[in-house]
Amino acid sequence: MAVTACQGLGFVVSLIGIAGIIAATCMDQWSTQDLYNNPVTAVFNYQGLWRSCVRESSGFTECRGYFTLLGLPAMLQAVRALMIVGIVLGAIGLLVSIFALKCIRIGSMEDSAKANMTLTSGIMFIVSGLCAIAGVSVFANMLVTNFWMSTANMYTGMGGMVQTVQTRYTFGAALFVGWVAGGLTLIGGVMMCIACRGLAPEETNYKAVSYHASGHSVAYKPGGFKASTGFGSNTKNKKIYDGGARTEDEVQSYPSKHDYV
């Protein structure tokens, strides 16, 4: 029962984690305009992995996609790749783990097969979580580096009295979502791996029980039928039924006369 609970909980935690990784990857607020100790602007800038957005005081928000691949920083491309790999591995892991769940019977699948699938999905979740954490951390490091660089030359002179104020960016909500989601996926994967150990068949020596019938002596061995059909003779075959209950100022969006990209 504890094994089923650990496996089920690991699955749910990983599911939440992967949903979080997907959400973080799609979010626009990976980096947000730093409002502290900065000139007060009437617009608020924030950026994601796929597009950058500007919100005006009126609440009007305009987003523009990064239409170039080659023109983007290599670090951003790396972060994108890590997040996508994390999502793909996590999705495959979820698919595998559904079939591996002890509370779900699929045909005559043996516990040894389920144990292997649980371990596989667990490893996938761990790698998925690590990819997400790595991706978010690389982006965060990039932000920190750029933040201090732009602080060092916050006002870039353009000759005479004309100056350009560089917009500084700080951590956006997506980073925290990504870190938490990656951590949850990692924890879920570890739980799946722990559950796998409990699912793995143990070597049990069954004693033969002799029944003396009149005329003939026939020995019935438990698991004998299984042995003849090619399945392991010492596999535990408990059927467990699990219930499986799993549980800015208001911004207005205005009709735009411009196409959003």
């Epitope: 009437a42 005081s57 009126s58 523009r64 104020v165």
Partner: antibody, heavy 119, light 113 residues
């Protein structure tokens, strides 16, 4: 049709106070940020204060900070500017302006109310 | 505070003439996030409140005649009236609509010869 009507102007003694009002109609007042802009006689425009639609964000010009208070009553569709410690240089026509959808511009203005600070 | 400098302070023109007025800001009004310039132009006729003409440096407000054209980027901006009409005689103000405090230029007065 969008309408902004200012009131509350008049003659005030230096150091005195005055509360200006701006009655809005023809649009959903609670959805728009609002500004006060003033214009001294025969002079240019000077931005005074801004208040966001839900009063969460408020900004003031350095010249009025600590003396003027911008506020709004959304159910009554009214914008206010409480002016205190008035000086002769505060003599101007006070306009209320609606923050437009785009470009942080003022797309509609009232006719203005004249505040004269004089002994 | 952003300083907005308008030139010339006054312009004397004849009807039908093309006219250009300038506005210079002490800091760039270009926002890198959406590549838009937060510069607004207003027209104020005698005894009237200002009227919005152009926002984002070059986008005409609805109802504004197409003879009014805004241009420029960064710190240098222009307002061009392709063919001045009698009703265009007014004061024209440019405004920094990017940084708080929002600041206006001193204005350019358009007069008829």
């Amino acid at each position: 049709d969008v309408q902004l009507v200012e009131s509350g102007g008049g003659l005030v003694q230096p150091g005195g106070s005055r509360k200006l009002s701006c009655a809005a109609s023809g649009f959903t007042f609670s959805r728009f940020g609002m500004h006060w802009v003033r214009q001294a006689p025969k002079k240019g425009l000077e931005w005074v204060a801004y208040i966001s639609s839900g009063s969460n964000t408020i900004y003031y010009a350095d010249t009025v900070k600590g003396r003027f208070t911008i506020s709004r009553d959304n159910p009554k569709n009214t914008l206010f500017l409480q002016t205190t410690s008035l000086r002769s240089e505060d003599t101007a026509i006070y306009y209320c302006g609606r923050l437009g959808f785009y470009g942080n511009s003022f797309d509609h203005w009232g006719q203005g109310t004249l505040v004269t600070v004089s002994a | 505070n952003i300083l907005m400098t308008q030139s010339p302070s006054s312009l004397t023109v004849t009807a039908g003439e093309k006219v250009t007025m300038n506005c210079k800001s002490s800091q760039s009004l270009l926002n890198g996030g959406n590549q838009r310039n937060y510069l607004t132009w207003y027209q104020q006729k005698a005894g009237q409140p200002p009227k919005l003409l152009i926002y984002w440096a070059s986008t005409r407000e609805s109802g504004v005649p197409d003879r009014f054209t805004g241009g420029g980027s960064g710190t240098d901006f222009t307002l061009t009236i392709s063919s001045v009409q009698a009703e265009d005689l007014a004061l024209y103000y440019c405004q920094n609509s990017y940084y708080y405090p929002l600041t206006f230029g001193a204005g350019t007065k358009l007069e008829l010869k």
